[in-house]
């Protein structure tokens, strides 16, 4: 009797997910830290020549809070981008029904702290679109798995998530 | 520092339209993440929230009250307002307008408040 | 509608710890804020985030909220804390509990 192949005939478990938990980060590392999003670049301004790095996401999947009533939150770096969309798909097949939802983007207010990475567009907070907070801890996870590279369980009402700069070495290599 | 101002009728007959202003001084309205509220109490003691206004006119309302409340914001004059319609006896109180702040996702605080009008609704 | 509940007063012994809860489901996932509200007085913000102190604010109050219950401590209650106590919570509805009155004997 001939043994299946290496990894041939085995059933694949799905990848037990447990959730953050509350103040917890993940790596467990500083944000603008090499080994996380990296360093603050500066602040992007509407007039600023690094405006144009910014792109708006229109994915229907996101819901958008929006308090500001002017767009802001919609826009981030590609990569942020990319990461969202990815997070977008899973939280929907983690709860049918669901959708994930931003309440906080690019910020041009100035009400985050000093060198805040929601400043250049590459920080978004999050929670589900129906704001059961029962559900945060694992809505980290799914954010973790989707490629954020960082994810802070920071309050009771939202996930914090950022990602490296477009022109950082990690990110164009895809680490 | 920043003070907030109530002013308007002490007495309302009943069926009538009641209508508060704030005004806010030693700082901007338009000044993001804070939420111009409404807050009302009634003689037996209880704090009832009315409703609130960010700068960008986005309102939220108490349930129970949002068929009869509008809450209104002039950037120019650094004010807020309420309007309450069909007011009854049960609309007796002291008003008081008041500073929310943002703790999470409308999570509000309210950390500063005006010294409240009383306002009396009868024939 | 969400409601929070209060006892409606509490006695403490000057010097002593005056603790007073709010109740409310899951009200853990919620941030608590609690005021303090002297006859004829405006309330005033003691605790929030529920936690913290807002400038000013003496450090004998503190605050904390987990599972159903929040709780607003005074350690070492003063004659002067002497008061009604609101706590409130909610998410894009804010809601008071129905308020304590302390009473430092």
């Known amino acids: 009797i001939i043994g299946p192949g290496r990894g041939f005939g085995k059933r694949r478990h799905p990848k037990k997910l447990t959730p953050l938990a509350y103040k917890q980060f993940i790596p467990n590392v500083a944000e603008k830290t090499l080994g996380a999003s990296g360093r603050y670049e500066g602040k992007i301004t509407r007039n600023s020549e690094r405006f144009k790095e910014l792109t708006p996401n229109y994915n229907p999947d996101i819901i958008f809070k929006d308090e500001e009533n002017t767009g802001a939150d919609r826009l981030m770096t590609q990569r942020c981008k990319d990461k969202l969309n990815a997070l977008a798909i899973s939280v929907m097949n983690q709860w049918p029904g669901v959708k994930l939802r931003v309440t906080e983007g690019w910020d041009e207010d100035g009400h985050h702290s000093e060198e805040s990475l929601h400043y250049e567009g590459r920080a978004v907070d999050i929670t589900t679109s129906d704001r059961d907070r029962s559900k945060y801890g694992m809505l980290a996870r799914l954010a973790v798995e989707a490629g954020f590279d960082w994810v802070y369980y920071e309050s009771k009402a939202h996930i914090h998530c950022s990602v490296k700069a477009e022109n950082s070495v990690a990110a164009k290599s895809g680490g | 520092q920043v003070q907030l101002q109530e002013s308007g009728p002490g007495l309302v007959k009943p069926s009538q339209t009641l209508s508060l202003t704030c005004t806010v001084s030693?700082?901007?309205?338009?000044?993001?993440?804070?939420?111009w509220s409404w807050i009302r109490q009634h003689p037996g003691k209880n704090l009832e929230w009315i409703g609130s206004i960010y700068y960008s006119g986005n309102t939220y309302y108490n349930p129970s009250l949002k068929s009869r409340v509008t809450i209104s914001v002039d950037t120019s004059k650094n004010q807020f307002s309420l309007k309450l319609t069909s007011v009854t006896a049960a609309d007796t109180a002291v008003y008081y307008c008041?500073?929310?702040?943002?703790?999470?996702?409308?999570?509000?605080?309210?950390?500063?408040w005006g010294r409240g009008t009383l306002v009396t609704v009868s024939s | 509608s969400y409601e929070l509940t209060q006892p409606p007063s509490v006695s403490v012994s000057p010097g002593q710890t005056a603790s007073i809860t709010c109740s409310g489901e899951?009200?853990?996932?919620?941030?608590v804020c609690w005021y303090q509200q002297k006859p004829g007085q405006s309330p005033v913000l003691v605790i929030f985030?529920?936690?913290k102190r807002p400038s000013g604010i003496p450090e004998r109050f503190s605050g904390s909220n987990s599972g159903n219950t929040a709780t607003l401590t005074i350690s070492g209650a003063q004659a002067m804390d002497e008061a009604d106590y609101y706590c409130q919570a909610g998410d894009s509805s804010a809601v008071f509990g129905g308020g304590t009155k302390l009473t430092v004997l």
């Open positions: 008041a500073r929310g702040n943002d703790s999470g996702d409308y999570d509000w605080y309210f950390d500063l």
């Open positions: 985030h529920d936690n």
């Open positions: 030693g700082g901007s309205i338009n000044s993001g993440g804070f939420y």
């Open positions: 899951k009200l853990g996932y919620k941030y």
